[in-house]
């Protein structure tokens, strides 16, 4: 067991690394290192991560497991996948809600909150793109409704109501005076 600067481990298999005195086999994912091996090429003493902790990778040096993240209820997050010994909790948004990133350069680990998806039907519009990673994309007004300002207005049910040009085009009425 030669020098002290990361010597090559002459052990069968490649998952050995010098930990102190000896080249030891590391711990599998989901296990932490309780004690290194006590003879060359030996097995380290590895213990399963306790509940609510995890280690996602094989390792030689982690003497404790990482604490599982808790989904942020204040941000309306829910657990899409519960934490296991080998994987952290996967937080996301419940159906009908979408992820709004809290930073401009958004990556998977970025902080986020959940926003309720726009209900196109309630706005009397077609759903052009269903809400998942971003908000719902609403399209044109539903049949029986016409564009008026920012919203969709119901076609008049009688000739007594006013029907501007756009209304007439959609609803089939002539403008009444």
């Amino acid at each position: 067991q030669g020098g002290t600067r990361s010597p090559r481990c002459d052990c069968a298999g490649d998952f050995h690394k010098k930990i102190g005195l000896f080249c030891c086999r590391g711990c599998p994912a989901g296990h932490y290192l309780k004690a290194p091996c006590t003879e060359p090429c030996g097995n380290s003493t590895c213990l399963v991560c306790p509940q609510d902790t995890f280690l996602a990778w094989e390792n030689h040096h982690n003497s404790e497991c990482a604490r599982c993240q808790a989904c942020d209820e204040q941000a309306s997050q829910v657990a899409l996948e519960n934490c296991s010994a080998v994987a952290d909790t996967r937080c996301g948004c419940k159906p009908g809600w979408f992820v709004e990133c809290q930073v401009s350069q958004c990556v998977s680990s970025s902080p986020f909150y959940c926003q309720p998806c726009l209900d196109c039907g309630a706005l009397h519009r077609h759903t052009r793109l269903l809400c998942s990673r971003r908000d719902t994309d609403c399209g044109t007004c539903l049949p029986g409704f016409y564009e008026h300002g920012d919203g969709c207005v119901s076609c008049p049910t009688s000739t007594l109501g006013s029907c501007p040009e756009r209304c007439a085009a959609v609803c089939g009425w002539r403008q009444m005076f």
Epitope: G2, G3, G20, L21, P36
Partner: antibody
Framework: EVQLVESGGGLVKPGGSLRLSCAAS????????MSWIRQAPGKGLEWVSY????????NYADSVKGRFTISRDNAKNSLYLQMNSLRAEDTAVYYC??????????????WGQGTLVTVS | DIEMTQSPSSVSASVGDTVTITCRAS??????LAWYQQKPGQAPKFLIY???NLQSGVPSRFSGSGYGTDFTLTISGLQPEDFATYYC?????????FGGGTKVDIK
């Protein structure tokens, strides 16, 4: 209570032999590595030898290599040091030591009270 | 072999003082360093492992630090029972080696 008790020390002539024993109790002896460490009168600590839990690996200080042999009997919870061709400079208190509580291999968290070997 | 050099070899101090002992390794040993306390006629007592971790039951006035080649044992607020000799020991490679010891005595 975790305990190590050495025995077998005494006065021996240069060139003579002695066998030290260390009796372990209070822990699962067969699970842990063991070592002998010595201390010459009025001097510091000197590591002598190491043996793994299964006896498959041993290591010695250069000063004792070829003269001393470390061994263990897990069935008897005992560690041994066979010392041959003893020299005056081997005069020391000999401690057996192990590590039952710490994730640092090669450190020693339990020690015996020591047994004195005098070569004269 | 890795040589462990302790300094000072002795230090005189009073109860309540802070005492610092240094240990230097002749090669890089990461954090594979232990500290022991020994009183006359007694076996050494394990204090600190992996350079900075306090062994259970050891008073918190003892602390260790360092990485690589330079290490320190600090006793903050020396107590009467702390007057003893202190040894560092490397466990990075065989042969295991100890420092020469630092005797802490009463001023």
């Amino acid at each position: 209570e975790v305990q190590l008790v050495e025995s077998g020390g005494g006065l021996v002539k240069p060139g003579g032999s002695l066998r030290l024993s260390c009796a372990a109790s209070g822990f699962t002896f067969s699970d842990y590595y063991m070592s002998w460490i010595r201390q010459a009168p009025g001097k510091g600590l000197e590591w002598v030898s190491y043996i793994s839990s299964s006896s498959s690996y041993t290591n010695y200080a250069d000063s004792v290599k070829g003269r001393f042999t470390i061994s263990r009997d897990n069935a008897k919870n005992s560690l041994y040091l066979q010392m041959n061709s003893l020299r005056a400079e081997d005069t020391a208190v000999y401690y057996c030591a192990s590590n039952v509580d710490t994730a640092m291999v090669g450190a020693f968290d339990i020690w015996g009270q020591g047994t004195l070997v005098t070569v004269s | 072999d890795i040589e462990m050099t302790q300094s000072p070899s002795s230090v005189s101090a009073s109860v309540g003082d802070t005492v610092t002992i240094t240990c230097r390794a002749s090669q890089h040993i990461s954090n594979w360093l232990a500290w022991y306390q020994q009183k006359p006629g007694q076996a050494p007592k394990f204090l600190i492992y992996t350079a900075s971790n306090l062994q259970s039951g050891v008073p918190s006035r003892f602390s260790g630090s360092g990485y690589g080649t330079d290490f320190t044992l600090t006793i903050s607020g020396l107590q009467p029972e702390d007057f003893a000799t202190y040894y560092c020991q490397q466990a990075d490679s065989f042969p295991l080696t100890f420092g020469g010891g630092t005797k802490v005595d009463i001023k």
